[in-house]
């Protein structure tokens, strides 16, 4: 289980007209369930549940976002309508090139997405929590738009981290 | 299927305002983030502005300050508030579903043309 | 902001012959860039998304490939059906950047 090192991104207009691009690093780790390896793209929100339905309406996905699924305590979905390793390979499907889960409230399913699969994703599966997942939780519900930068080896140069 | 459907394009005067829409169906609106891009009667394309899932903007330095973007997804529909209208804004309007880029379903453009 | 340059802006080639467009952006955009193909009267239509990913439904005579800041669209054996223009777009951060175009013609 390689640690994950995870930079967000966060694009902000500035009253002069430039981008102020506020950079925050957080860790998680990489999952069985998915490929050790780099991957970007803009953060999409995804309830657990969004990733039950199955009414593939649509003809073609639009590819390279990360999802971030917060999983619920288990108490409040006792009878899921997918694993969560499913929900993982659903949102791939549909196009994410990385999915991260904020598993503070369910940490079973780190158990769940490292079980050992013979047909891993060919993408990455993080799971983050504690500190971290707050930290992209709190940038994810900010109405701006962010970026996932996910590296297996810690960045090159250091970043300037802003804390959100 | 999906569609998407610009509208609200016209003939406006320069220093005017107009709302371009543009109307979505055949998949969950708010499910995915939208683009506006323009094009300049036979010239090249230009990026002008996003709206992400959650609502956060980005825009094109020729437009920042003079458009906004929003959408209501109840109404599965995305706009284009265009003020302060010049005539370098004459183009064609499109609409395009996406994340990072411009993706697989863009509408047909409505055509917005500034002159006194 | 990222600056992305096209090459050429029009390119005259023969049916069956071997195409090549590029792209050079002002820095370094790892394969945030993607091709849009456009006919006339039509909207662009994504033909390449990530520097080398082909989109669904569109031909494999066509191709991207990258190394550094330099992207290029190959179309092995032309077609009637490819004389079109050819937009390149930079991704990477906004404010997201086209190239000028190329407008590709019959011989």
């Known amino acids: 289980k390689e640690t994950a090192f995870v930079e967000v991104v966060l694009f902000e207009s500035s009253p002069s007209g430039d981008y102020t691009t506020y950079t925050t690093g957080l860790t998680g780790r990489f999952s069985r369930a998915g490929a050790t390896l780099s991957a970007e793209g803009e953060i999409v929100q995804m309830h657990p549940l969004g990733l039950c339905n199955n009414n593939d309406e649509e003809d073609l996905y639009e590819y390279g976002w990360v999802g971030v699924v917060k999983l619920e305590q288990p108490e409040l979905d006792p009878k899921p309508c997918l694993t969560v390793l499913g929900k993982a390979k659903r949102a791939v499907q549909r196009g994410a090139t990385a999915v991260i889960f904020d598993v503070s409230e369910n940490p079973e399913a780190i158990d769940q997405l490292n079980q050992g699969s013979e047909d891993p994703l060919k993408r990455p599966v993080v799971y983050v929590k504690g500190a971290d997942a707050i930290k992209l939780m709190n940038i994810v519900n900010k109405q701006k738009v962010a970026r996932a930068r996910i590296q297996h080896r810690p960045p090159r140069q250091p970043t300037e981290y802003f804390d959100m | 299927e999906v569609q998407l459907v610009e509208s609200g394009g016209g003939l406006v005067q320069p220093g005017k305002s107009l709302k371009l829409s543009c109307s979505a169906s055949g998949f969950t609106f708010s499910s995915y983030g939208m683009h506006w891009i323009r094009q300049t009667p036979g010239k090249g394309l230009d990026w002008v502005a996003y709206?992400?899932?959650?609502?956060?903007?980005v825009y094109a330095d020729a437009v920042k300050g003079r458009f906004t973007i929003s959408r209501d997804n109840a109404k599965n529909t995305l706009y284009l508030q265009l003020n302060s209208l010049q005539s370098e804004d004459t183009a064609i309007y499109y609409c395009a579903r996406g994340y990072n880029y411009p993706g697989a379903y863009w509408g047909q453009g409505t055509l917005v043309t500034v002159s006194s | 902001d990222i600056q992305v340059t096209q090459s050429p802006s029009s390119l005259l080639a023969s049916l069956g012959e071997r195409v090549t467009i590029t792209c050079q952006t002002s820095q370094s955009i790892s394969n945030n860039l993607n091709w849009y193909q456009q006919k006339p009267g039509q909207a662009p239509m994504l033909l390449i998304y990530y520097a080398t990913s082909l989109q669904t439904g569109m031909p494999s005579r066509f191709s991207g490939q990258y190394s550094g800041r330099s992207f290029t669209l190959t179309i092995t054996s032309l077609e009637p059906e490819d004389i079109a223009n050819y937009f390149c777009?930079?991704?990477?951060?906004?404010?997201?950047?086209f190239g000028a175009g190329t407008k590709l013609e019959l011989k």
């Open positions: 777009l930079q991704h990477y951060n906004p404010p997201y950047t």
């Open positions: 709206i992400s899932t959650n609502s956060g903007t």
